[in-house]
Interface confidence: medium
């Protein structure tokens, strides 16, 4: 889980070990702050859980692409 040491900076110290179904992901944000030990992606799931993931992993990149496309598609 992400950890906010001194708000508003949120850092990730561990990444999830397992792929998360892309259909359970609602949104993401990138963590690039120099105050954090590593770059990370925080996914928010449809049930509002926040998960730290490694941006170097392919599934994480694929998931971000999927969510980006979903955001660009106007809802009918």
């Amino acid at each position: 889980q992400p950890d906010a040491i001194n708000a508003p900076v949120t850092c990730c110290y561990n990444f999830t070990n397992r792929k998360i179904s892309v259909q359970r992901l609602a949104s993401y944000r990138r963590i690039t702050s120099s105050k954090c030990p590593k770059e990370a992606v925080i996914f928010k799931t449809i049930v509002a859980k926040e998960i730290c993931a490694d941006p170097k992993q392919k599934w994480v990149q694929d998931s971000m692409d999927h969510l980006d496309k979903q955001t660009q598609t106007p809802k009918t």
Epitope: R18, S21, Q23, T45, V47, K49
Partner: antibody, heavy 119, light 113 residues
């Protein structure tokens, strides 16, 4: 394509434990979320537990808490479900079921393992 | 936990007739941001594992005949077999995958009259 193969039928005495295995091929276990569902004779489907990547841990149905243990051996891509303190009501077919990265639902099931609990 | 309730428990219809199964969830399984209902329908024949028929409440799994259709949103869902065939005799289950624990309906047995 994911394929699952479970271990064979078991007959156990009340009070004993049973350990059922489920071997994955086509994917590695770490690419999937493995779950276990059981079905007593002539009854419905009952979710027992499984790996929840959102919590990064195995979660269990409340009914089975303390009596079931689900483990994984990633070196052999095999998942295990152990149920202890067996009673006659545990007589059922035990299924492993999984989903792949793009789906959140169970799209792959094995044929199941019949566990009979009888004295 | 989300409770899934199916009705009826069993139904008998003539060959070629329409068969309708309902499934109600105790809370919504619709995620409004992507407008998806996290609900599936399975068909189970004796001695076999459940077979996925419908996902996202209305999308037919590949290879499933088009006489099977799913509809509904939020908390109320329907599986319809437009023209019942002999090979459709089975038990049908709905299941939600919106939030854990994943829960199933109790099943509906479909028979030929």
């Amino acid at each position: 394509q994911v394929q699952l193969v479970q271990s064979g039928a078991e007959v156990k005495k009340p009070g004993a434990s049973v350990k059922v295995s489920c071997k994955v091929s086509g994917y590695t276990l770490t690419e999937l979320s493995m779950h276990w569902v059981r079905q007593a004779p002539g009854k419905g489907l009952e979710w027992m537990g499984g790996f929840d990547p959102e919590d990064d841990e195995t979660i269990y149905a409340q009914k089975f808490q303390g009596r079931v243990t689900m483990t994984e051996d990633t070196s052999t891509d095999t998942a295990y479900m152990e149920l202890s303190s067996l009673r006659s009501e545990d007589t059922a077919v035990y299924f492993c079921a999984t989903n792949d990265f793009w789906s959140g639902y169970f799209d792959c099931w094995d044929q199941g393992t019949l566990v009979t609990v009888s004295s | 936990d989300i409770v899934m309730t199916q009705s009826p428990d069993s139904l008998a219809a003539s060959l070629g007739e329409r068969a309708t199964i309902n499934c109600k969830s105790s809370q919504s399984v619709l995620y409004r941001s992507n407008n998806k209902n996290y609900l599936v329908w399975y068909q189970q024949k004796p001695g076999q594992p459940p077979k996925l028929l419908i996902y996202w409440a209305s999308i037919r799994e590949s290879g499933v005949p088009d006489r099977f259709s799913g509809s509904g949103s939020g908390t109320d869902f329907t599986l319809t077999i437009s023209s019942l065939q002999a090979e459709d005799v089975a038990v049908y289950f709905c299941q939600q995958y919106y939030s854990s624990p994943w829960t199933f309906g109790q099943g509906t047995k479909v028979e030929i009259k």
